[in-house]
């Protein structure tokens, strides 16, 4: 082993020390003889220490031990003694205490050896081993008065070997995290928790992270154990962004042609029932009836024209039931109805006329008379020297039960090239022209139109009570939606329980998955805020799809096109959620289409409007818009505008 | 486009007789009645009456009754008044106006002036 | 016979003010009421027809009210145009009658 050239010389000046140990003490006889029991001169001092420097140091000293004893003469003990000590450097010892391991007489001086971790002439001063490659040491040398020792950074002990260090493994300790995951790492440890949840040092436990206190939704966030999810508000138009944070608008995917006709006029604006247009014809003269119209419509019931007096009078009402055209007449209190001709519900554009005659009631289709009613009497009845006709479209002045046969008079049917009593009409053009509202899609085909601003809603009752009295009634919900949507979000169909003003079931359009932050077209089926199914669908390809729902007790299933979709609750979700939707069954609910009423936006996976054409079936039942208890103005009925033709 | 033309200003003198035209276009002429108003100069507008156009039977108001008289030429679509016995007071803008039970198309007018 | 009373016969204002006529009749007569505008040398002019109807091509600076005998006429805010005299006529029963006319000139 190689030992530092200071730390050899230390380590070898001992051995010197004992190889002169016998010429010192021949030397110091000799100074007894010459200095003590004699006086000595200089020269005499010389020849005992054979040296200038020795005898340089040692005479004047000598002199003055005379000076405080007397000479040697005197024969006293403290001048043998002072003179025997002087030749002797070390004694009194001018080395330090502390630090010194040997102190070395030299001629006329002295060596003090050092102890290991000190130096300086006097041994007094500590030698900082740590200065020099961290004295051996691994991680923190530790310097102290002429020693040092060796330590390791917490979460490391030392080894045996008292300078490398080996990491501590803090995990080996059951009690080190809690309930969260230990992980070791160099010189510490960690606790860790699962995404959306924070260690809590003084619980030992993971918490949940309440995201929406960082402010990370646009709009409204819900926190969820180890989650959160914002949402937008879809009543005003508006879905999650790409980031699932943010707010867009909800934009139309597919373009529909839905350009207007100015010189229509659309009569399933009101769906109170009400006419759409209402013309009172006052004459001096006796004047006959004589209407005359382009009309179009894939409705098989309603109501296109009313003409008369108020109902207990003489009046005349046109309308469609099973696609048929009907004449209901009231003359002198009496009242008759008449149907017949062609099915004219098939959506292309016919001339439809009545005209009033002498003693009789001419209907005609496409210049062809459908109908001949002999009448007794006129429908302009004469008031105050005046006659007077009202004739309103698309509805009746009084309510339907007070018909002759009560009829749903809400029409979605399209009128245009209008005659009333051969006069021209600029009332209703003008009006018409300035009121969209007022006009028909240019192109129609089959079925309904949801434009994305509103809702119908019906009264429907999921209940079924089975024929042996007694037993536990079932229920069951069964949808079958036919879809051309013309945007990605939007609800197809939901339940709506007023009391709680909770929704316990609904099926949606939605463009991202929830729970994984993926954007992704879908169709969600959800107890409440729970999506108990997603399917993946085309939403905006422009084609039918066909979405198919299906719960009853202990099961619940969503197809869409023919394929099953994905589950996204255990077993025992599932039944849990089937109770919260059977418990709201039990109760009133009311039946949504294309819509939800002003529910919070947490209600429900998606709350925004339906936009596309649609026609729901419910529990084998084909829902007919005409029959809902509400529905919104803008949706017709029993009509929808074809998907735009690709631009060349 | 309906239209209802009058004959030019007359200038008579008391005594005198008088007839004024009414040329009706743009519609079937015998669906509606024709009626005619008077307007003195600085004075208000007076319903005289109106006759119908499919029996050409005439009706007055109980101020025009006597000198004044309605009448028709269905084959040239155009209805008359005539004022016999022309008096000062007589003086005004006779106007026609289709029987709508109010009146939305008006004949321009004819200024009958009565003065010896 | 109703008799119509129109007032005021004439009044005068600048334009931009709102000017209001009434018509009262001496019986009741729904509110089958309507206004015209005529203007000198001319043949008066429908603006609004029964039930309170604005005429097609009727500025809405016109409008109507009233049902039974009280009607008023109300022009919200006069143009150059408008100066003319304004009658009410009853189309509730025969014989039909005119109120007396209201003058409305530039202040």
């Known amino acids: 082993a190689l030992l530092p050239a200071r730390e050899a010389t230390q380590f070898l000046r001992p051995r010197q020390r004992r190889a002169f140990q016998v010429f010192e003490e021949a030397k110091q006889g000799h100074l007894e003889r010459e200095c003590v029991e004699e006086l000595c001169s200089r020269e005499e001092a010389r020849e005992v220490f054979e040296n200038d420097p020795e005898t340089d140091y040692f005479y004047p000293r000598y002199l003055d031990c005379i000076n405080k004893y007397g000479s040697p003469y005197t024969k006293n003990s403290g001048f043998a003694t002072c003179v025997q000590n002087l030749p002797d450097q070390c004694t009194p010892n001018p080395c330090d205490r502390k630090g010194t391991q040997a102190c070395q007489d030299l001629m006329g001086n002295f060596f003090c050896l050092c102890k290991a971790g000190w130096g300086g002439r006097l041994c007094d001063k500590d030698v900082n081993e740590c200065s020099q490659e961290n004295g051996g040491c691994l991680q923190i040398c530790h310097n102290k008065p002429g020693s040092f020792h060796c330590s390791c950074h917490s979460g490391f002990e030392l080894s045996s070997d008292g300078r490398t260090c080996q990491d501590i493994d803090e995990c080996a300790d059951s009690e080190a995290c809690g309930e969260a995951r230990c992980k070791n790492l160099p010189g510490s440890y960690s606790c860790l928790c699962d995404e959306g949840f924070a260690y809590s040092s003084q619980e030992k436990a993971c918490r949940d992270v309440d995201e929406c206190l960082q402010g990370r939704c646009e709009q409204v966030c819900v926190n969820s154990p180890g989650s959160y999810t914002c949402h937008c508000d879809g009543r005003g138009g508006l879905k999650l962004s790409q980031d699932m944070d943010t707010c867009e608008d909800i934009l139309p995917c597919v373009p529909f042609s839905v350009a207007k006709s100015v010189k229509s006029l659309y009569l399933g604006r009101m769906f109170s029932g009400t006419p759409v247009i209402r013309l009172r014809f006052k004459r001096l003269q006796p004047t006959r009836l004589v209407a005359e119209f382009d009309f179009r419509t894939f409705d098989p019931e309603g109501i296109l024209l009313f003409a008369g007096g108020h109902q207990d009078s003489t009046w005349i009402v046109l309308a469609l039931r099973a696609g048929r055209l009907e004449l209901q007449l009231r003359y002198n209190g009496v009242g008759r109805v008449t149907s017949s001709g062609p099915v004219i519900n098939h959506g292309m554009w016919q001339t439809i006329s009545v005209e009033e005659l002498a003693r009789n009631l001419v209907i005609k289709v496409n210049r062809d008379a459908v109908m001949k009613i002999a009448v007794a009497g006129d429908l302009f009845q004469p008031e105050r020297g005046l006659y007077h006709l009202n004739l309103t479209v698309g509805g009746i002045p009084f309510h339907e039960k007070d018909l002759v046969q009560p009829i749903n008079p809400r029409l979605d049917g399209c009128m245009r090239s209008w005659n009333w009593l051969n006069g021209e009409d600029t009332t209703i053009q003008e009006t018409v022209k300035v009121n969209t509202r007022m006009q028909c899609f240019s192109v129609t085909e089959r079925g309904s139109f949801y434009p994305g601003s509103g809702f119908a809603f019906y009264s429907l009752d999921y209940m079924r009570t089975p024929l042996d009295v007694g037993t536990e009634s079932t229920w069951e919900v069964e949808v079958v939606a036919h879809i051309r949507p013309a945007a990605d979000t939007g609800v197809l169909f939901a339940l709506w329980a007023p009391d709680l003003r909770a929704v316990p079931l609904s099926v949606a359009l939605v463009d991202y998955h929830s729970t994984k932050k993926l954007k992704k077209q879908l169709v969600v089926l959800a107890v409440e805020h729970t999506a108990l199914a997603l399917m993946e669908i085309k939403v905006c390809d422009g084609q039918e799809h066909v979405v198919t729902v299906s719960l009853r007790d202990g099961e619940a299933t969503l197809e869409v096109d023919g394929t099953r979709g994905q589950s996204e609750v255990s077993a025992a979700q599932l039944q849990e959620r089937l109770a919260v939707l059977e418990r709201h069954l039990r109760s009133p609910v009311l039946t949504f289409a294309g819509g939800l009423p002003d529910v919070p936006v947490t209600s429900a996976p998606v709350t925004a409007f339906y936009r596309g054409c649609m026609t729901l079936e419910v529990n084998r039942r084909l829902l007919d818009l005409d029959e809902a208890a509400y529905k919104h103005s803008d949706i017709t009925a029993h009509s929808c505008p074809p998907v735009e033709p690709a631009a060349a | 486009q309906v239209h209802l033309v009058q004959s030019g200003s007359e200038l008579k003198k008391p005594g005198a007789s008088v007839k004024i035209s009414c040329k009706a276009s743009g519609y079937t002429f015998t669906n509606y009645g024709m009626n005619w108003v008077r307007q003195a100069p600085g004075q208000g507008l007076e319903w005289m009456g109106w006759?119908?156009?499919?029996?050409?039977?005439?009706t007055y108001t109980e101020e025009f009754k006597g000198r004044f008289v309605f009448s028709l030429d269905t084959s040239v679509t155009t209805s008359y008044l005539q004022i016999s016995t022309l008096k000062a007071e007589d003086t005004a803008v006779y106007f026609c106006?289709?029987?709508?039970?109010?009146?939305?198309?008006w004949g321009q007018g004819t200024l009958v002036t009565v003065s010896s | 016979e109703t008799t119509l009373t129109q007032s005021p016969s004439s009044l005068s204002v600048s334009t931009g003010d709102r000017v209001t006529i009434t018509c009262i009749t001496s019986t009741d007569i729904d509110d089958d009421m309507n206004w015209y505008q005529q203007k000198p040398g001319k043949a008066p002019k429908l603006l609004i027809s029964e039930g309170n109807t604005l005429r097609p091509g009727v500025p809405s600076r016109f409008s109507g009210s009233g049902s039974g005998t009280d009607f008023t006429f109300t022009i919200s805010s006069t143009q150059p145009e408008d100066f003319a005299t304004y009658y009410c006529l009853q189309t509730d029963s025969v014989p039909l009658t005119f109120g007396q006319g209201t003058k409305v000139e530039i202040k």
């Open positions: 106006a289709r029987d709508e039970g109010w009146f939305v198309y």
């Open positions: 006759i119908n156009t499919n029996t050409g039977e005439p």
